[in-house]
């Protein structure tokens, strides 16, 4: 989004010691990989690992970045432009309506489904009714498991923040 | 249930101004960050700015940078985009929306908002 090489963009040994990189607002604003001074006229680099922003802003802080839970693995670093990018460990996932937490997959279809999706780290197993092929969704009964499943492999991240 | 009615669209020339509003419903609407998006005929719908929940602090996409400011009143649960210097390409229905829960301090993608408003139409054309 910016023509500034930000923090990302350079080496380790590049990147910005405690004193921090300072450009001026264009329009009152700060790029990506920065926020705003107290008094507008400067742009302060936020602090690699540590704080991000990811547009133009007038952020009088960057945003702190976020720490993956227990039960989610880092995908990618959180860099002075992007946040870390988190995700469901293997066997788990994690719902749109409760983004918050991974849920363990269900092992199996409930008796006369069939699984035609596997448990990924954004959703759980699919099952289908063997005869109409419509979609079961909602808790498994208690009499299931004639189908069983390996984890998913993940291929995308579940969640991504900025 | 979570309501955001959007208002303040309508036709102008390229370099006039509009305000658009979004009115919402909800009681959280003053401890979330908020958006506005825009979509574009055959566009997929595109980030443009995201306030912070109190109100101090925003993000911009580059196209509007300087352009556009966003801003929020809890007290009257209303969200702001003041428009000026507008271009044919700003034409779009523009959309207020609110993050899921569990989503980054300013969510700036489409899939980290899970509440959207029916949208005002803007039109920007000589």
């Known amino acids: 989004e910016s023509a500034l090489i930000t923090q990302q963009d350079l080496a380790p040994q590049q990147r910005a010691a405690p004193q921090q990189k300072r450009s001026s607002p264009s329009e009152g604003l700060c790029p990506p990989g920065h926020h705003i001074s107290e008094d507008g006229r400067d742009c302060i680099s936020c602090k690699y690992g540590q704080d991000y922003s990811t547009h133009w802003n007038d952020l009088l802080f960057c945003l702190r970045c976020t720490r993956c839970d227990s039960g989610e693995v880092e995908l990618s670093p959180c860099t002075t432009t992007r946040n870390t990018v988190c995700q469901c460990e293997e066997g788990t996932f994690r719902e749109e309506d409760s983004p918050e937490m991974c849920r363990k997959c269900r092992t199996g279809c409930p008796r006369g489904m069939v699984k035609v999706g596997d448990c990924t780290p954004w959703s759980d197993i699919e099952c289908v009714h063997k005869e109409s092929g419509t979609k079961h969704s909602g808790e498994v009964p208690a009499v299931e498991e004639t189908v069983t499943s390996s984890p998913g492999t993940p291929a995308s991240p579940c969640s991504l923040s900025g | 249930e979570v309501q955001l009615l959007e208002s303040g669209g309508g036709e102008v020339q390229p370099g006039g101004s509009l305000r658009l509003s979004c009115a919402a419903s909800v009681s959280t609407f003053g401890t979330s960050p908020v958006g506005w998006f825009r979509q574009a005929p055959g566009k997929e719908r595109e980030f443009v700015s995201a306030i912070r929940w109190e109100g101090v602090g925003a993000y911009y996409a580059e196209s509007v940078k300087g352009r556009f400011t966003i801003s929020k009143d809890n007290a009257k649960r209303t969200l702001y985009l003041q428009m000026s210097s507008l271009r044919a390409e700003d034409t779009a229905v523009y959309y207020c929306?609110?993050?899921?829960?569990?989503?980054?301090?300013?969510?700036?993608?489409?899939?980290?908002?899970?509440?959207w408003g029916q949208g005002t139409l803007v039109t920007v054309k000589p």
């Open positions: 929306a609110l993050p899921r829960r569990g989503e980054s301090e300013l969510p700036s993608t489409v899939k980290e908002y899970g509440y």
